[in-house]
Interface confidence: medium
């Protein structure tokens, strides 16, 4: 996901609508003049604010990356959502890209979760249930896995 | 790695006033969006407020808009929060939060990378 914090734009274009602050803040969808005296919409498509706020420009919108699928677009009050595309996923942790799902388990253990765009397979062992701990394996250990992605043996 | 240490929390009256900091330490966070979350007994984490990047500008959840307000000082790398007019559904541990990156808002929980221990905050008569 590709995404700068704040987006410099040009202000005070004609078509940009204004309202008022409401305590020194301006609406979802809208971002403060250096003034202070206005609210001025965010551009839709462009960028967007999601909260009350006092921003000098709104957020610029994230374009979601190759590998990556659109969910909704951006609006005004509400950023892109990109998902993993099938047979990737991406973790809470390191967000940064999808990452291929493996396409089987180390041998003696079994698929208890499929894929999802937010996790990938997840393996338990065969007798214990104990999950997978993301280790990198033995060679001989690996059942099957996506090319570049060695299975993980469990904890 | 960044470690935040929240303080200022405490038992307050209604009506009364707070004021939290986040010391940080191990990041300079003058290019990063800090913000606040909290939890209240029994609910989910919510979204407080959030200081976008070097003093660009700031957010607010809707609840707390013209009560609260968020502030930084990047040469103390510290976050502050001052609380007025509390009520007693203010009442939660306040967590300090960083982003994972730079260019990341912070508005929900996904965007955080680095949470401090909490502070409780007590609104009661």
């Known amino acids: 996901i590709t995404q700068q914090d704040l987006a410099p734009q040009q202000r005070a274009a004609p078509q940009q609508k204004r309202s008022s602050p409401s305590e020194g803040l301006c609406p979802p969808g809208h971002h403060i003049s250096e003034d202070g005296r206005d609210c001025i919409s965010c551009k839709y498509g462009q960028d967007y604010s999601t909260h009350w706020n006092d921003l000098l420009f709104c957020l610029r919108c994230t374009r979601c990356d190759s590998g990556e699928v659109e969910l909704s677009p951006c609006t005004t009050t509400r950023n892109t959502v990109c998902q993993c595309e099938e047979g990737t996923f991406r973790e809470e942790d390191s967000p940064e890209m999808c990452r291929k799902c493996r396409t089987g388990c180390p041998r003696g253990m079994v698929k208890v979760g499929d894929c999802t765009p937010w996790s990938d397979i997840e393996c338990v062992h065969k007798e214990s249930g104990t999950k997978h701990s993301g280790e990198v394996p033995a060679v001989e250990e690996t059942v099957t896995s996506s090319p570049g992605t060695p299975a993980s043996p469990c904890s | 790695e960044v470690q935040l240490l929240e303080s200022g929390g405490g038992l307050v009256q209604p009506g009364g006033s707070l004021r939290l900091s986040c010391a940080a330490s191990?990041?300079?966070?003058?290019?990063?969006?800090m913000g606040w979350f909290r939890q209240a007994p029994g609910k989910e984490r919510e979204f407080v407020s959030a200081s976008v990047w070097n003093n660009g500008g700031n957010y607010y959840a809707d609840s707390v808009k013209g009560r609260f307000t968020i502030s930084r000082d990047n040469s103390k790398n510290t976050l502050y929060l001052q609380m007025n007019s509390l009520r007693a559904e203010d009442t939660a541990v306040y967590y300090c939060?960083?982003?994972?990156?730079?260019?990341?808002?912070?508005?929900?929980?996904?965007?955080?990378?680095?949470w401090g221990q909490g502070t409780l905050v007590t609104v009661s008569s």
């Open positions: 939060v960083v982003a994972r990156t730079p260019e990341t808002p912070i508005t929900s929980a996904r965007g955080a990378n680095y």
């Open positions: 191990g990041r300079s966070i003058s290019n990063y969006a």
